[in-house]
């Protein structure tokens, strides 16, 4: 069964910068990836980026850069302009549309240990590479 993984990281150097990593583990050709925050797109979530393998990417603030990491994984850099760092408690969702199998989605948030209030910066967790 295909799976989607989501990992949210806070940049160690800049506490206002976050990166969402998403990957698809399954067959078929990925046709579209939709990233949203605050819940799934269509269920109260707000669309942050749409990535198409051929037609490119489209993103909306506060998304800074959306890009393909591999044929089956993407990353989305976010710039948190607010001092309160709302991203820390936000859910990010990734939906992969793979033809002809269909769509799979998953959500994730910043691990509690990555709280910006902690003195030590978070240690980045190794990203699972779907292409290995």
């Amino acid at each position: 069964t295909p799976e989607v993984w989501v990992q949210v990281q806070m940049e160690a150097t800049e506490l206002s910068s976050f990166t969402v990593h998403c990957g698809f583990l399954g067959p078929g050709s990925i046709s579209l990836v939709t990233v949203s925050w605050g819940g799934p797109d269509g269920a109260g979530g707000t669309k942050l980026a749409v990535l198409h393998p051929e037609l490119g990417t489209r993103q909306w603030a506060p998304a800074r850069q959306a890009r393909w990491e591999t044929q089956s994984s993407i990353s989305l850099a976010l710039e948190d302009s607010g001092a309160s760092s709302p991203f820390a408690n936000t859910t990010f969702c990734c939906k992969f549309a793979s033809f002809p199998e269909g769509s799979w989605e998953s959500c994730g948030s910043l691990p509690p240990s990555s709280d910006p209030g902690l003195s030590a910066p978070p240690t980045p967790v190794p990203i699972l590479r779907a292409d290995l």
Partner: antibody
Framework: DVKLVESGGGLVKLGGSLKLSCAAS????????MSWVRQTPEKRLELVAA????????YYPDTVKGRFTISRDDAENTLYLQMSSLKSEDTALYYC?????????????WGQGTSVTVSS | SIVMTQTPKFLLVSAGDRVTITCKAS??????VAWYQQKPGQSPKLLMY???NRFTGVPDRFTGSGYGTDFTFTINTVQAEDLAVYFC?????????FGGGTKLEIK
Amino acid sequence: DVKLVESGGGLVKLGGSLKLSCAASGFTFSSYHMSWVRQTPEKRLELVAAISRDGDSTYYPDTVKGRFTISRDDAENTLYLQMSSLKSEDTALYYCSRHEDYFGFAMDSWGQGTSVTVSS
Amino acid sequence: SIVMTQTPKFLLVSAGDRVTITCKASQSVSNDVAWYQQKPGQSPKLLMYYVSNRFTGVPDRFTGSGYGTDFTFTINTVQAEDLAVYFCQQAYRSPWTFGGGTKLEIK
């Protein structure tokens, strides 16, 4: 203007074979996933085959698996459906349709259909 | 396969009425639902995608809502030209499946 034109339908005997064609024009055919959808005499719509834009991935529901084969010729801008071991329940109007990635795989263009009647 | 149960099967309305069609999926289909209109003697035409997005040229009297398993399609102020069969479809998991259709007739 996007145009899909099906052909190849007709009257065929039980257990027989038929090959349907769908000529596409007005868009870059090789950039789109395509499907065959049939409409039964009771007017129900049913997906019978799907093929990815690169032609590497195909899908068939259990009702036609092993009997139908979908293929595409991007040089000729044509979609095909090879049907064999035809059953009476395959009697339907067969539509060729185009999937739009940005519309969540909704089918944004359909042909006019070609009729297939399986008789005993 | 995901079953899309569409109700009602028939609707007899007057021009100017408001019409609501519902579609229930046998499991969650996220927001991957489309609605089609099929006029007599024609092929189906896409009206709505991703539940609530109108396809090019579709009048704003057509609206859609829902998420997960329950979806609603509404025609505000029905017009004579809306005489057709309407189908919902899930494009979440293959095989893409359709509702049984709702035949809209104008009094």
